[in-house]
Amino acid sequence: EKAMVDGSWLDLAKRSKLEAQPFAHLTINATDIPSGSHKVSLSSWYHDRGWAKISNMTFSNGKLIVNQDGFYYLYANICFRHHETSGDLATEYLQLMVYVTKTSIKIPSSHTLMKGGSTKYWSGNSEFHFYSINVGGFFKLRSGEEISIEVSNPSLLDPDQDATYFGAFKVRDID
């Protein structure tokens, strides 16, 4: 019986530890996509509607803030699209990029952790164009560090929650 009690306590401890594991999945706020034709920071994301969720991390001022030291898996998916009903592209040669950046407040510094993308030729003869970027990686993050997303040509972002999103989840503690 003691073994059973110990076992259930162990399960509970494991479960509560899992429940405390930080994670975030943030989806683009389509009502507030910034303008610009060069690299801009995306600061408006949902954290509590549709597929978006957050636990034991903080979303503030457009940045995802780490609350616990640890090794995290970071990911971002960015979709760009253009349909002729919205008008024409002013240029057919495009650089479509995403940058995942870490900012440290304690020691003021900023580092690009991941970038992805391509130069594209989107011909004016086509009715529809689409391009998707997915980046992901494993990083040591400290409490207080902030993760943000920058993209080129935000006016071409696909505003759907299944198209433009980023997130993080803690994989293990720092030894």
Epitope: S35, G36, G87, A90, T91
Partner: antibody, heavy 126, light 103 residues
Framework: QVQLVQSGAEVRKPGASVKVSCKAS????????IHWVRQAPGQRLEWMGW????????KFSQKFQGRITVTRDTAASTAYMELRSLRSEDTAVYYC???????????????????WGQGTLVTVSS | EIVMTQSPSSLSASVGDRVTITCRAS??????LNWYQLKPGKAPRLLIY???SLQSGVPSRFSGSGSGAEFTLTISSLQPEDIATYYC?????FGQGTKVEIK
């Protein structure tokens, strides 16, 4: 204030060419696209083409492809539309119009014509 | 190629009347629809863009609505200076125009 001032009326014989100018003032010419639109007597408005004043890129209606040229002189803040091989059905009022989309804020030419020139009457007659 | 069709082609109304002009697209164009006012010998004027956004400087008696393939321009209280031809437009395609006159 934003203004587009076009050149004066022209009379041409069939087969000739005409070049209409559109001088912009009151805004940064290079940050916007200029469209050319015409209206023949009793007809609807008809889009002809655009030029991105910043990089010189152009796009034309299939109907005018091969006989239209649109250029710009950024130093003079002026756009030009030349139509060649004129025929009587090209008799129309030709307008230049600015696209509402600012190229600094994005790269979509939205076809929202927020400011127009006063129009240039081109008459093609033998 | 998208075709824009306006109705009616002309109308006559009294000062103060509510006037409605309809524009149909041959396929869905979301909300990418603009309305212009044309008066003889004058530069055309953008009234409404993006189906319902009022261009700055345009009187609030003008309003636009609709999405998909059907759109409406409404003049809530017709004024003598509103005598003109009105055109709907989606990118490269214009409607055939609606001539508005005073009774």
């Amino acid at each position: 204030q934003v203004q587009l001032v076009q050149s004066g009326a022209e009379v041409r014989k069939p087969g000739a060419s005409v070049k209409v100018s559109c001088k912009a003032s009151g805004y940064d010419f290079s940050n916007y696209a200029i469209h050319w639109v015409r209206q023949a007597p009793g007809q609807r408005l008809e889009w002809m083409g655009w030029i991105n004043a910043g990089n010189g890129n152009t796009k034309f209606s299939q109907k005018f492809q091969g006989r239209i040229t649109v250029t710009r002189d950024t130093a003079a803040s002026t756009a030009y539309m030349e139509l060649r091989s004129l025929r009587s059905e090209d008799t129309a009022v030709y307008y230049c119009a600015r696209d509402l989309s600012n190229m600094v804020r994005g790269i979509i030419i939205a076809y929202y014509f927020d400011y127009w020139g006063q129009g240039t009457l081109v008459t093609v007659s033998s | 190629e998208i075709v824009m069709t306006q109705s009616p082609s002309s109308l006559s109304a009294s000062v103060g009347d509510r006037v409605t002009i309809t524009c149909r697209a041959s396929q869905s164009i979301s909300r990418y629809l603009n309305w212009y006012q044309l008066k003889p010998g004058k530069a055309p004027r953008l009234l409404i863009y993006g189906a319902s956004s009022l261009q700055s400087g345009v009187p609030s008696r003008f309003s636009g609505s609709g999405s998909g393939a059907e759109f409406t321009l409404t003049i809530s209280s017709l004024q003598p200076e509103d005598i003109a031809t009105y055109y709907c437009q989606h990118t490269r395609a214009f409607g055939q125009g609606t001539k508005v006159e005073i009774k």
